[in-house]
């Protein structure tokens, strides 16, 4: 498999058959698949060097792994997008052997003197062809030469099989399955041959191709493949339940932010709640996690403005649940990214020198910002797309707080909507879905560069649009939701999560 290890070294060779038998639309589809693969790999913070070859009668090398920009995913994608099927029109035979020899030439080193670290570099060849080679001879001989070069299968104690993966995608109207199978790697419990039909569900294909065991602690990563559970798609999501004898129970959501902490809303708890009465589950697991302590933001005080006629005051409505035992990360349990951390800098593929302010400008620009939250409907987690009103609609969004029960007599809305809040909901630019009571404490998320970054904690809403946890179809335009802006509570997060190795900026 493609081992995505951010500390490892990898070369990926993209080889695309542009011969007559492929056809323009299949060529375009294959290109799209490769573009998606480049993005998927880049989302892991891995920066492999890419080689890019198209071929028919002759190969054309568009990107060499030795080029300085070969590890710049955006640049490689640009080169790939600029390739046309017509480029091989005049010499449109199929010489797969020559194309693989072009890959071999990129792998090999001058004067037979291997560079430092050559033996730690993994090589991945992704060949998109119909397998109908009609000139140049059998391409399998070049695969053998490549194996020889990389010293694969020669040492009984160290076969190095994981240093070469050859994936073959059968593209085109007619595919020679025998030839394709012969070229692809053969490894136990792994799939290295894919058909055109597979390319309709690329996430499923990538799931078969990628080994992310070295990057399970990466924040904001998800798997969207068809066989995945809700928690493959939202692996940070935590369900919180507070059992109160003779008073029923309160349901909330939260987000895994580190191996020991779940971030949620403070209002989910009262000062009387004992740790043993708080149930937290993650990854869709039945068992509850043991809780060490709930840490409230020191400035949170729901009764803080009762004298001023404000019955409930949600400023600083955030809490961290500290778990007794370390979470074991896996594909259904992994953290979400937090603002102003090194992990988020890497997730957004920003320079290491990026400041907290620059992250804020990237994630919360002064405009309508596409975001999402996760809600549970009929025991299924679903993503709800909303827009954070952070530009010209911000004022009107915040003013609608006056329609919230108990806030009708508030003279100045900034008394309840403090600078700590982000506002979503309403009908412009689109009709946003609203949060339900049980969504409280869950993350408000910005999805960027294939990663998920939490920017807010769901706190309170103007209108209860959910009857029995079912959203009403028709909701008033003033149905707004307010979320604690994590950029505004960073000092507290930084202090409480200082031992969690999140690398706060």
């Amino acid at each position: 498999k493609i081992v995505l290890d951010p500390s490892g070294s990898m070369n990926i060779y993209l080889v695309l058959d542009g011969s007559d038998s492929i056809g323009a639309s299949n060529f375009t589809g294959a290109k799209k698949c490769l573009v998606n693969l480049i993005e998927k790999v880049a989302s892991y913070g891995v920066k492999p060097r890419y080689g890019l070859v198209t071929y028919a009668t002759y190969p054309k090398i568009w990107v060499k792994v030795s080029e300085a920009d070969s590890s710049n995913a955006d640049w490689v994608t640009k080169q790939l997008n600029e390739i046309n099927y017509e480029d091989h029109k005049l010499k449109s035979g199929t010489n797969t052997k020559k194309a693989l020899q072009a890959v071999y030439s990129m792998m090999s080193w001058p004067d037979d003197v291997p560079p430092e670290g050559w033996n730690r570099t993994r090589h991945v060849i992704i060949l998109m062809t119909d397998g109908l080679h009609n000139m140049g001879g059998d391409p399998i001989t070049v695969i053998d030469e490549i194996r020889d070069l990389l010293y694969i299968g020669k040492d009984r104690k160290n076969p190095r099989e994981d240093y070469l993966d050859v994936y073959v995608f059968g593209v085109g109207p007619l595919v020679n399955q025998v030839n394709i199978n012969a070229l692809a790697s053969k490894k136990d419990n792994e799939q290295h041959v894919f058909k055109v039909k597979d390319m309709e569900n690329l996430e499923d294909v990538f799931y078969q191709m990628i080994d992310e065991s070295q990057s399970l602690s990466l924040c904001g990563m998800v798997w969207e493949h068809r066989k995945g559970t809700d928690y493959h798609k939202q692996p940070w999501q935590a369900k919180i339940s507070v059992i109160r004898p003779s008073k029923g129970h309160e349901s909330c959501m939260g987000a895994v932010v580190s191996e020991y902490f779940v971030l949620t809303a403070a209002h989910c708890f009262t000062v009387d709640d004992k740790e043993h009465s708080i149930k937290v589950s993650v990854g869709g697991e039945k068992r509850d996690l043991e809780i060490e302590v709930v840490l409230f933001h020191p400035n949170y005080n729901i009764n803080g403005k009762k004298e001023a006629g404000i019955p409930e005051f949600y400023d600083y409505d955030v809490a961290l649940i500290k778990l007794k035992n370390k979470l074991k990360y896996g594909q259904t349990i992994r953290p979400i990214c937090l603002p102003c951390t090194e992990g988020t800098t890497r997730a957004l593929r920003l320079p290491p020198t990026t400041t907290c302010q620059q992250q804020k400008e990237e994630l919360l620009p002064a405009q309508d910002i596409k975001a999402l939250f996760v809600s549970e409907e009929e025991k299924k987690l679903t993503r709800k797309e909303v827009y954070i009103k952070n530009g010209d609609k911000k004022g009107s969004c915040e003013r609608d707080a006056q329609y919230a029960p108990g806030y009708d007599k508030v003279k100045d809305i900034s008394e309840v909507v403090t600078p700590r809040f982000l506002c979503t909901g309403g009908v412009s630019p689109y009709a946003d879905p609203n949060t339900c009571r049980g969504d409280s404490g869950g993350p408000l998320i910005v999805h960027k560069r294939s990663r998920f970054i939490q920017v807010g904690v769901i706190s309170w809403g103007v209108v209860d649009v959910c009857k029995n946890q079912k959203r009403q179809k028709q909701v008033p335009a003033h149905a707004r939701d307010f979320h604690i802006n994590l950029f505004q509570v960073l000092p507290w997060l930084k202090e409480k999560l200082q031992d969690e190795d999140l690398g706060f900026l």
Epitope: D112, N119, Y151, K154, D155, R156, K157, N158, R160
Partner: antibody, heavy 121, light 111 residues
Framework: EVQLVESGGGLVQPGGSLRLSCGTT????????MSWVRQAPGKGLEWLGF??????????EYAASVKGRFTISRDNSKNTLYLQMNSLKTEDTAVYYC????????????WGQGTLVTVSS | EIVLTQSPATLSLSPGERATLGCKAS??????????MNWYQQKPGQAPRLLIY???NLESGIPARFSGSGSGTDFTLTISSLEPEDFAVYYC?????????FGQGTKLEIK
């Protein structure tokens, strides 16, 4: 055809030095471990050390009895293995063999004919 | 280091007889499903010759009357029917752990 030929043996005084060479042909030298083995008169075989193949950067390994006194090196451009022997003792008198150590099964599948080293005053 | 003890030190047999040579290791020479034990034959004035590798695999060009068996710490070289040219010294050698080591040898002589 695989061939290994040792050279450089001879008479040397105790405390002296000697460098043995092992020229090879018929195989891709850099892809193999290469070992030195010796045999004292009337005694058994004693493994002295090897030079690993290219994946391991040709790093050497030594038997405790010669560590610090003997050095194994190779010149891949000349397909030649070397054994530099320093501070020689009378008990180092032996026939010295070089052998190709096949990493496909970690066994010495080809041997040279041997070269005699006599340490005597 | 792994110490290899061969038995017997000397074995006197006649041509046509079956020879069984033993080799015991001070610790296991198995790794990842393979036994890294090799057998060599040496005749006077000649370099050793590989007979068996990885405990039971016959090196190419070696007659089929030679066979090897065993795993872990106990290994056997068997010559099913001795030919006159088989009388020589036989060494076992382990390549599982560095440093490699040889047994002291078994001398197979004509009775």
């Amino acid at each position: 055809e695989v061939q290994l030929v040792e050279s450089g043996g001879g008479l040397v005084q105790p405390g002296g030095s000697l460098r043995l060479s092992c020229g090879t042909t018929g195989f891709t030298f850099r892809d193999y471990y290469m070992s030195w083995v010796r045999q004292a008169p009337g005694k058994g075989l004693e493994w002295l050390g090897f030079s690993r193949h290219r994946v391991y950067g040709y790093t050497p390994e030594y038997a405790a009895s010669v560590k610090g006194r003997f050095t194994i090196s190779r010149d891949n451009s000349k397909n030649t293995l070397y054994l530099q022997m320093n501070s020689l003792k009378t008990e180092d008198t032996a026939v010295y063999y070089c052998a190709r150590d096949n990493p496909g099964y970690y066994a010495m599948d080809y041997w040279g004919q041997g070269t005699l080293v006599t340490v005597s005053s | 280091e792994i110490v290899l003890t061969q038995s017997p030190a000397t074995l006197s047999l006649s041509p046509g007889e079956r020879a069984t040579l033993g080799c015991k290791a001070s610790q296991s020479v198995d790794y990842d499903g393979d036994s890294y034990m090799n057998w060599y034959q040496q005749k006077p004035g000649q370099a050793p010759r590989l007979l068996i590798y990885a405990a039971s695999n016959l090196e190419s060009g070696i007659p089929a009357r030679f066979s090897g068996s065993g795993s872990g710490t106990d290994f056997t070289l068997t010559i099913s029917s001795l030919e006159p040219e088989d009388f020589a010294v036989y060494y076992c050698q382990q390549s599982n752990a560095d440093p490699y080591t040889f047994g002291q040898g078994t001398k197979l002589e004509i009775k």
